[in-house]
């Protein structure tokens, strides 16, 4: 996997250690799970025929993938700097047991899958420090996240990965809606 | 047609204060961060100073920081900056631009002369 | 302080191509650093030719491009034109800051 924003031998050197939250290193390291995302997505696409497939809405019913709506604020109409922000973190936070479900789902590729559930983790601590003075911040439930978690590994073989192309393609747009929006933070 | 006008620069003596103010049209003033960027005569650009799209966040140049304020008012899709504690160094056209995203470049005014001088 | 260097002057002939580029004095030129390049002509203000690496400004001619090589940002005018002469500064996003470089003075001839 490659080395993570700010773990880079360059960067330990530059003198410009840049606070956790700043926009430099949140862009880096969004940037650093989309390219773990490509790889993944990679992988997926030469395993399988899913990401010609056009039977997509059958898995999607199955799943609540975070989505970004106009009513999040993470548009350019209606933008709205502090509902976006809370949007972010919540759907990031959502992600993370479809990232759980995504780390038994890959052979060549394991360690970039770990990678990028690693990364996310980060993102997510860098973006509540930089939202320190939100609170409408929802966790989802543990318990509720595993049963979906067991009833997504029940699914049989065609459905798993139908579902991993479509966490891997969902959470790819949900980054660069995030990181379009964020630039104007 | 998107349009910047920078308004406010004049004379001031050192130790003073001056408000500017940066009135935009022709873009969706509310869903972009702003800033002031400065250039003193003969020399390069020098960016000061950059605030969050709603407002929430600001950020300053080192050369400014602790006497210079940015502000917006987005119902009136207006940027400000209040300057305090004027020096001859701060004698600068000052421009203010909006900050590329959204699948658009960057736009700057035409500038606002702010000399300083006793 | 990071610095932000660029190439003090160039000249290119009329017609050919010229590549002027943007560093930091220490670390490498990212994504994440927007690189953004500005054409400046005297007594005018500083017009935005390419911002976030690679896109062009609208109404700018596609003889001008951005991108980033090794780890620089560069700026490459093909089949420069006399009207191309002028100051050329980048600038780059640093941390939660902006930094401009010191500019290129360009001399067509």
């Known amino acids: 996997a490659p080395v993570p924003p700010g773990e880079d031998s360059k960067d330990v050197a530059a003198p410009h250690r840049q606070p956790l939250t700043s926009s430099e290193r949140i862009d880096k390291q969004i940037r650093y799970i989309l390219d773990g995302i490509s790889a993944l997505r990679k992988e997926t696409c030469n395993k399988s025929n899913m990401c010609e497939s056009s039977k997509e809405a059958l898995a999607e019913n199955n799943l609540n993938l975070p989505k970004m709506a106009e009513k999040d604020g993470c548009f350019q109409s209606g933008f709205n700097e502090e509902t976006c922000l809370v949007k972010i973190i919540t759907g990031l936070l959502e992600f993370e047991v479809y990232l759980e479900y995504l780390q038994n789902r890959f052979e060549s590729s394991e360690e970039q899958a770990r990678a990028v559930q690693m990364s996310t983790k980060v993102l997510i601590q860098f973006l509540q420090k930089k939202a320190k003075n939100l609170d409408a911040i929802t966790t989802p439930d543990p318990t509720t996240n595993a049963s979906l978690l067991t009833k997504l590994q029940a699914q049989n073989q065609w459905l798993q990965d139908m579902t991993t192309h479509l966490i891997l393609r969902s959470f790819k747009e949900f980054l660069q809606s995030s990181l379009r929006a964020l630039r104007q933070m | 047609e998107v349009q910047l006008l920078e308004s406010g620069g004049g004379l001031v003596q050192p130790g003073g204060s001056l408000r500017l103010s940066c009135a935009a049209s022709?873009?969706?003033?509310?869903?972009?961060?702003m800033s002031w960027v400065r250039q003193a005569p003969g020399k390069g650009p020098e960016w000061v100073s950059r605030?969050?799209?709603?407002?929430?966040?600001?950020y300053y140049g080192d050369s400014v920081k602790g006497r210079f304020t940015i502000s917006r008012d987005n119902s009136k899709n207006t940027l400000y900056l209040q300057m305090n504690s004027l020096r001859a160094e701060d004698t600068a056209v000052y421009y203010c631009?909006?900050?590329?995203?959204w699948g658009s470049g960057d736009y700057w005014g035409q500038g606002t002369l702010v000399t300083v001088s006793s | 302080q990071t610095v932000v260097t660029q190439e003090p002057s160039f000249s290119v002939s009329p017609g050919g191509t010229v590549t002027l580029t943007c560093g930091l004095s220490?670390?490498?030129?990212?994504?994440?650093?927007?690189p953004g390049w500005y054409q400046q002509t005297p007594g005018q203000a500083p017009r935005a030719l390419i911002y976030?690496?690679?896109d062009r400004h609208s109404g700018v001619p596609d003889r001008f491009s951005g991108s980033i090589s090794g780890n620089k940002a560069a700026l490459t005018i093909t089949g420069a034109q006399a009207e191309d002469e002028a100051d050329y500064y980048c600038?780059?996003?640093?941390?939660?800051?902006?930094?401009f470089g010191g500019g290129t003075q360009l001399t067509v001839l």
């Open positions: 631009a909006n900050r590329a995203g």
């Open positions: 022709g873009f969706t003033f509310s869903s972009y961060a």
């Open positions: 605030i969050s799209a709603g407002g929430g966040s600001t």
């Open positions: 220490s670390g490498s030129v990212t994504a994440s650093n927007y």
């Open positions: 976030s690496t690679n």
């Open positions: 600038a780059l996003d640093i941390g939660d800051i902006t930094e």
